[in-house]
């Protein structure tokens, strides 16, 4: 999914409103120092892209985050605010129903979201240094 | 972990090519941009090239503008560095270098390099 | 060309503060990095984002940047922090290191 034509300022609300106090919360206890940077994003389609791949693509020793409540709010945002996006994720979660799994919080899963955090703050604080 | 390896390097006679690779491991390579950088013997830092994360936008030094070409594939985690024409004067330690990037939708802006190689040397001798 | 200008050397004795600067036109509008570099070693940022601290970097280092200057300051040096260090920012398509400063620890 190309995630150019997203309304980017609304999709910010949301992560300020509710997504970033659930990625504390998902974090709470593990120091933000803990974890290299391992995933970067460029621009702010490209952090969606990333943010897309690391919250709703399973990974090796983290099976699946789409079950977290600041997922579901993601894919919530991404759907309402990204046009086209709905249709695009269809076949991908009647994938993950036949997939699912009993949730568990394992380190590899702290680390996958301690990278989100980081890219969720790269979309919402653009690097560019105020003139 | 986070590392960076260079290769590639060696001896080679003016006017003749060398090609250095860079292979990434231990993080997502495709979401970063990469940097050349070189140092020459008991010389200071110098920037040769960079590359965004998805091989859209090059930039290189004037130096070597027309010689050097900077090229990924990220479906293989490296980086390379294809090197023409190469002068006495491009005798050094080239290293890899992670680097911080954002782009709007006017121009591209590269940052701080946070990862770098140990570095590969390429000696110009006749 | 956009250049970065750095004194040679600087030294300090141990315990004290090392000010190291970096001058540029407009240089504040600019972020400015810093980078360590001991003798056959691989350079090392040490600030990022003109103040900023990566994980694993001691507090004693710090930076600041306005104006045509970026100053990188360590406090109570230790004898560890001897080494080249090398300023650097990003001008209209390029990268600009500086030419570098050798931090002597007397």
């Known amino acids: 999914y190309d995630f150019t034509n997203c309304d980017f300022e609304k999709i910010k609300a949301a992560y300020l409103s509710t997504i970033s106090k659930d990625l504390i919360t998902y974090m709470s206890g593990t120091k933000s120092t803990e974890f290299n940077n391992t995933v970067s994003c460029s621009n702010r389609p490209h952090c969606l892209t990333e943010i897309q791949s690391l919250t709703f693509n399973p990974t090796a020793g983290c099976a699946s985050l789409a079950k977290e409540m600041f997922a579901m709010k993601t894919k919530a945002a991404l759907a309402i605010w990204c046009p086209g996006y709905s249709e695009t994720q269809i076949n991908a979660t009647q994938a993950m129903k036949k997939r699912r799994k009993r949730k568990v919080t394992t380190n590899k899963c702290l680390e996958q979201v301690s990278q989100l955090q980081g890219l969720w703050r790269r979309f919402n604080r653009p690097l560019l240094k105020q003139q | 972990q986070v590392q960076l390896v260079e290769s590639g390097g060696g001896v080679v006679q003016p006017g003749r090519s060398l090609r250095l690779s860079c292979a990434a491991s231990g993080f997502i390579f495709s979401s970063y941009g990469i940097h050349w950088v070189r140092q020459a013997p008991g010389k200071g830092l110098e920037w040769v090239a960079v590359i965004s994360y998805d091989g859209s936008y090059k930039y290189y030094a004037d130096s070597v503008k027309g010689r050097f070409t900077i090229s990924r594939d990220n479906s293989k985690n490296t980086l390379y560095l294809q090197m023409n024409s190469l002068r006495a004067e491009d005798t050094a330690v080239y290293y890899c270098?992670?680097?911080?990037?954002?782009?709007?939708?006017?121009?591209?802006?590269?940052?701080?390099?946070?990862?770098w190689g140990q570095g590969t040397t390429v000696t110009v001798s006749s | 060309s956009y250049e970065l200008t750095q004194a040679p050397s600087v030294s300090v004795s141990p315990g004290q503060t090392a000010s190291i600067t970096c001058s540029g036109d407009?240089?504040?509008?600019?972020?400015a990095c810093w980078y360590q570099q001991k003798p056959g070693q691989s350079p090392v940022l040490v600030i990022y984002q003109d103040k900023k601290r990566p994980s694993g970097i001691p507090e004693r280092f710090s930076g600041s940047n306005s104006g045509n200057t970026a100053t990188l300051t360590i406090s109570g040096t230790q004898a560890m922090d001897e080494a080249d260090y090398y300023c650097q920012a990003w001008d209209s398509s390029t990268v600009v290191f500086g030419g570098g400063t050798k931090l002597t620890v007397l």
């Open positions: 270098a992670r680097g911080d990037s954002w782009n709007d939708r006017l121009n591209y802006y590269f940052y701080d390099m946070d990862v």
């Open positions: 407009k240089l504040g509008d600019k972020y």
